[in-house]
Interface confidence: low
């Protein structure tokens, strides 16, 4: 806690500027008016304050806004955001995507901190759903963001938001998450033609049911082995040899290299040896 001391004569801050970096902590507390600070928050980031000095500035804002900062202040917090605790952030009402971007920018290049997680949670809850622009922003800063959500949270993602999802955003998703995302992707991309549809849906196929895989096998999609290996085992098992051959196209020869791994191993065991022999790959059921 900073002691309340009178501001020395002539040191009262008229504006937030570079001269303040020479103020001691107690002088900042005594000589900087909290309301002035709030209206000139955008200047704080341009001034090389020490973290100790930033502590004082935060303390002044906390006193001015005990119920939580207004968005006009939040948007210009800059590096002061790194001083906020999740408890501080829970008091905020952040509605502007620009504000969210400004604060994520401060944390760019770092792992998602508890502060950022709380900020995102507050923002998404305030919006009621994870809309496309928000998802676009979050996955740009945190490619793994989507896969950090629970299946329940993912259920609030509208199909229109799926257009913002890039293949790398799904790299760490598990089958339960893809089970939720796949039907949304199918709906989002339903009006695309065959080859374009496959390019878009490919990353989501870990949630696809057997009947959709059968349908894809009729469309000359040439699925690569990496995608095939991520399919649900229970969805692959009912596929016939002919269907898998059509689904993989020229990549079918890759089954040999994967014959000991799921889902290929389990699928091979379900097939008749005569059918497997038609592939000419030496697969043993």
């Amino acid at each position: 806690e900073v002691e309340k001391t009178a501001c020395p004569s002539g040191k009262k801050a008229r504006e937030i500027d570079e001269s303040l970096i020479f103020y001691k902590k107690w002088e900042l507390e005594a000589c900087v008016d909290a309301a002035l600070l709030a209206t000139q928050m955008d200047r704080v980031n341009a001034i090389p304050f020490t973290y100790e000095q930033l502590d004082v500035l935060k303390h002044k804002l906390d006193e001015l806004y005990p119920q939580g900062y207004p968005e006009s202040v939040i948007q210009h917090l800059g590096y002061l955001f790194l001083k906020m605790s999740p408890e501080d952030i829970r008091k905020w009402n952040v509605t502007s995507l620009e504000t969210l971007k400004a604060l994520l920018e401060v944390n760019k290049g770092h792992e998602m901190s508890p502060q950022v997680a709380t900020l995102i949670d507050r923002f998404v809850k305030g919006r009621g759903q994870l809309d496309k622009d928000t998802l676009d922003t979050l996955t740009a800063f945190y490619p793994g963001y989507l896969c950090s959500l629970s299946p329940e949270e993912l259920s609030s993602v509208p199909p229109s938001s799926i257009w913002a999802v890039r293949p790398q955003d799904l790299d760490t998703c598990d089958p339960r998450q893809l089970d939720v995302l796949y039907p949304k992707a199918r709906l989002a991309f339903q009006n695309m033609n065959g080859s374009e549809y496959f390019v878009k849906i490919q990353s989501f196929l870990g949630g696809a049911p057997t009947e959709d895989l059968k349908a894809l096998s009729q469309q000359n999609v040439s699925m690569d082995l990496a995608t095939f290996m991520k399919l649900r085992t229970d969805a692959v098992l009912p596929l016939t040899v002919a269907e898998v051959q059509k689904l993989l196209g020229p990549h079918v020869e890759g089954l040999k290299a994967e014959e000991r791994h799921r889902p290929v191993r389990d699928w091979i065991l379900r097939q008749r040896q005569d059918d497997l022999d038609t592939l000419g790959l030496g697969l043993q059921g």
Epitope: W163, R166, S222, P250
Partner: antibody, heavy 119, light 107 residues
């Protein structure tokens, strides 16, 4: 260091054919989708065609569809563009480019090869 | 097809200036936008992808912003080597399309 080297350009008469090649080095060629982009003299960039990592999926601009064919030979680290029924408006520098991790943007480009269609 | 409109088509600036180029798409493309720099008689070079992500090795004076339909490329402290033509490109859907280009010239 990634290098893309185009070849096969030259002067051809309208209605004629050319085959462009793009030899790639310094990258795992089979792991990246590739594309051809062209630039007519004094004009901007125009995307021509793209191909998936396996070669199983191809895309074309409407201006070349049915006349141009993109292909790749992953064993030779080479991308191709077969151009048939060439027209004067196909005159351009043709660049091959490698798709980056961000799907659809191109992080490495070749230096280009000039195709001139004229009688 | 998605049309990409760049403005201005050309501009004159001095070393040290802050330069802003805008790119507008005819329909929403999320953040699926790239920026390229091209110098005379040279191949294009990638600057920005995903609207705001800096390509490896590109100086930090280049920055990109925007999402949806409106995008901006900013060069914060123009250097002699930055005089070139800049193109935006959408990769939300095929056919991939480029903007018409913005030529940045010495004042």
């Amino acid at each position: 260091e990634v290098q893309l080297l185009e070849s096969g350009g030259g002067l051809v008469q309208p209605g004629g054919s050319l085959r462009l090649s793009c030899a790639a080095s310094g990258l795992t060629f089979r792991s990246y989708a590739m594309t051809w982009v062209r630039q007519a003299p004094g004009k901007g960039l125009e995307w021509v065609s793209g191909i998936s990592v396996s070669g199983g999926i191809t895309y074309y601009a409407s201006s070349v569809k049915g006349r141009f064919t993109i292909s790749r030979d992953n064993s030779k680290n080479t991308l191709y563009l077969q151009m048939n029924s060439l027209r004067a408006e196909d005159t351009a520098v043709y660049y091959c480019a490698k798709r980056g991790a961000a799907v659809g943007s191109f992080d490495y480009w070749g230096q280009g090869t000039l195709v001139t269609v004229s009688s | 097809d998605i049309q990409m409109t760049q403005s201005p088509s050309s501009l004159s600036a001095s070393v040290g200036d802050r330069v802003t180029i805008t790119c507008r798409s005819s329909q929403g493309i999320g953040s699926w936008l790239a920026w390229y720099q091209q110098k005379p008689e040279k191949a294009p070079q990638s600057l920005i992808y995903a609207a705001s992500s800096l390509q490896s090795g590109v100086p930090s004076r280049f920055s990109g912003s925007g999402s949806g339909t409106d995008f901006t490329l900013t060069i914060s402290n123009l250097q002699p080597e930055d005089f070139a033509t800049y193109y935006c490109q959408q990769y939300n859907s095929y056919p991939l399309t480029f903007g018409g280009g913005t030529k940045v010239e010495i004042k």
